[in-house]
Interface confidence: low
């Protein structure tokens, strides 16, 4: 049975398409190609006589068509108007005509799209943002990318308008993007330049640092306040409820016991209209809360190198203290094999190596005083030779 096949079926505007013929009968007088789904003399493109090997253009010939002896038809520099059906009529030597219809689709080369937005400075948890991919074109698939990833499944993301519009419901600070849209048709694809959102948010609850509460008289008090916010927050300080200054940092030199009290940091975002405060108690005292001597324990004090691990634990009954570790007068951890956990109370070494042998101790401290544990000795033995390389099987 006579058939035709378009190569390719989807053609880019300006390119060429070959209407390929299969199962062409042997004994032929000639054949003709017509535009459309049926034989219509007014829409003949070209006729070809086998005997004379001569091609004759028809009324629908545009000068871009070439017919081949195997009946295939080449159309060059195609336009979207060339989209549609094409019918081949074969005149066989027994004067029985046979017909076959094929088709192809011409798509434009797509331009670089752009993204328009109805709100480029949305407020977190309040505003929605609608992105629209321009231009609107026929027979085009619209795709969206966030952070170079296809759209995640999320109830806050909605596609509409044939996927041309992406709506973010109730934006968050993590929705900054970048956003890109891509337009596709069967013959081309193009991606927009990235667009980012300036999400206005905050301020979050401020943090006052350092975390110290106790200070000695004569010391300098330097407090810093930070709250996540966009645009950046404006800060002010109050001491015992009385306004002091509008700065992010508060500095009081040579403090006395009279400087004890509640220190309030106030953070304000003029765009969102939101305010947040944090209160910190400062105690200025001569008294030194005595930090008790901590106890140090080891899961084992003699270990096999390159094989065993060891956990050292620093125990104290004091609260509000910090812990640091020392080995041969150097602070730890000093290698990737050493890990601190549980608020620095535990030092883990995994695996233990020869250079880890020696004396360890821990120190507990607060802003006012500190105390050291007795040292503990870690012995490292090597019972057997290690593997030639450090890689484990698999």
């Amino acid at each position: 049975q006579l058939t035709t096949e378009s190569m390719p079926f989807n053609v880019a505007e300006g390119k060429e398409v070959l209407l390929l013929v299969h199962n062409l009968p042997q004994q032929l007088f000639g054949y003709s190609w017509y535009k459309g789904e049926r034989v219509d003399g007014n829409r003949q493109i070209v006729g070809y006589a086998i005997g004379t090997q001569q091609a004759t253009p028809g009324p629908a010939n545009s000068g871009r068509e070439t017919i081949y002896p195997n009946a295939s038809l080449l159309i060059q520099n195609v336009t979207q108007n060339d989209t549609g059906f094409y019918t081949l009529q074969v005149i066989k030597s027994d004067l029985v005509n046979e017909e076959a219809t094929g088709q192809f689709h011409v798509y434009p080369e797509l331009p670089k799209p752009s993204i328009s937005s109805n709100n480029s400075n949305p407020v977190e948890d309040k505003d929605a943002v609608a992105f629209t991919c321009e231009p609107e074109t026929q027979d085009t698939t619209y795709l969206w990318w966030i952070n170079n990833q296809s759209l995640p499944v999320s109830p806050r993301l909605q596609l509409s308008n044939g996927n041309r519009t992406l709506t973010l419901l109730s934006v968050t600070r993590n929705d900054t993007g970048p956003y890109e849209c891509e337009i596709q048709n069967p013959v081309s694809a193009n991606r927009s330049d990235p667009v980012t959102l300036n999400v206005t948010y905050g301020p979050d609850t401020p943090t006052i640092s350092p975390s110290d509460t106790y200070y000695r008289p004569g010391a300098n008090l330097s407090l810093s306040c930070y709250a996540a916010s966009n645009p950046p927050a404006q800060y002010s300080w109050l001491i015992n409820g009385t306004f002091q200054q509008s700065t992010q940092e508060l500095f009081i030199p040579n403090i006395t016991v009279n400087n004890s009290g509640s220190y309030t940091c106030h953070a304000n975002n003029s765009v969102t209209g939101c305010n947040r405060t944090t209160v910190k108690t400062i105690i200025v005292t001569e008294l030194s809360p005595v930090v008790a001597k901590p106890q140090i324990k080891a899961s084992k004090t003699t270990v096999t190198g390159d094989k065993d691990s060891v956990n050292l634990t620093c125990s104290t009954n004091d609260t509000g203290i910090s812990i640091r570790w020392f080995f041969k007068n150097q602070s730890l951890p000093s290698s990737e094999r050493m890990k601190l956990s549980q608020g620095n109370t535990t030092l883990s070494i995994n695996p233990v190596k020869r250079e880890d042998a020696g004396t360890y101790w821990c120190e507990v401290f607060n802003p006012i005083s500190k105390n050291q544990s007795d040292p503990i000795m870690l012995n490292v033995n090597y019972n057997a030779l290690p593997q030639e390389n450090g890689l484990s099987p698999g």
């Epitope: 698939t141 596609l159 044939g162």
Partner: antibody
């Protein structure tokens, strides 16, 4: 209730042609991408092709098989030309509810058997 | 040979938990969602899991899906005799620009 009903299968000689249809009901057909999936006797599933959702008539081309749709008739088609013995299979039409963003097939027809044999 | 690799068979006794694996590559499972389908003998496939781990309404919570890297798994807990079927994984393949299925796993309930 979503329903997909395939038709048009049967016995055809090698080199012959066949057009399968899939009539859809119970949902807005033009809003969904549709696919054809086939399964040779005793074998696994094999995706044939898909056609995206609206507007109007869509077309995709894979080798000798043309998939098309007519949204006005709520019907999906598969035109199969130059059929070979290896095209023998049950042909299912299936619906993709994700519009192609995370392709999956939530509803399947009961299938129509195409047998290519002389 | 299928683009996604599944074991041809799996088995378990009633009440047991069985897992079926599906291995692919970065062009399919690694960067696209995985679906799982159940095909009871003589019937059309049925969607069990989509988007790696989501269950359509009506699918019992005995069925669960997961994905790690370029591999996915379907777990069936509290195995029942009616779970005896063929199970297929599927995912979009960006390199092939098409949807690919695993070769299927025949689950036998002993």
């Amino acid at each position: 209730e979503v329903q997909l009903l395939e038709s048009g299968g049967g016995l055809v000689q090698p080199g012959g042609s066949l057009r399968l249809s899939c009539a859809a009901s119970g949902f807005t057909f033009s809003n969904y991408a549709m696919s054809w999936v086939r399964q040779a006797p005793g074998k696994g599933l094999e995706w044939v092709s898909w056609v995206r959702q609206a507007p109007g008539k869509g077309l995709e081309w894979v080798s000798r098989l043309t998939i098309s749709r007519d949204n006005s008739k709520n019907t999906l088609y598969l035109q199969m030309n130059s059929l070979r013995a290896e095209d023998t299979a049950v042909y299912y039409c299936a619906r993709d509810p994700t519009k192609g963003y995370a392709p999956t097939f939530d509803y399947w027809g009961q299938g129509t058997l195409v047998t290519v044999s002389s | 040979q299928s683009v996604l690799t599944q074991p041809p068979s799996a088995s378990g006794t009633p009440g047991q938990r069985v897992t079926i694996s599906c291995s692919g590559s970065s062009s399919n499972i690694g960067n696209n969602y995985v679906s799982w389908y159940q095909q009871l003998p003589g019937t059309a496939p049925k969607l069990l899991i989509y988007a790696d781990s989501k269950r359509p309404s009506g699918v019992p919570d005995r069925f669960s899906g997961s994905k790690s890297g370029t591999s996915a798994s379907l777990a069936i807990s509290g195995l029942r005799s009616e779970d005896e079927a063929d199970y297929y994984c599927g995912a979009w393949d960006a390199s092939l620009n098409g949807y690919v299925f695993g070769g299927g796993t025949k689950l036998t309930v002993l």
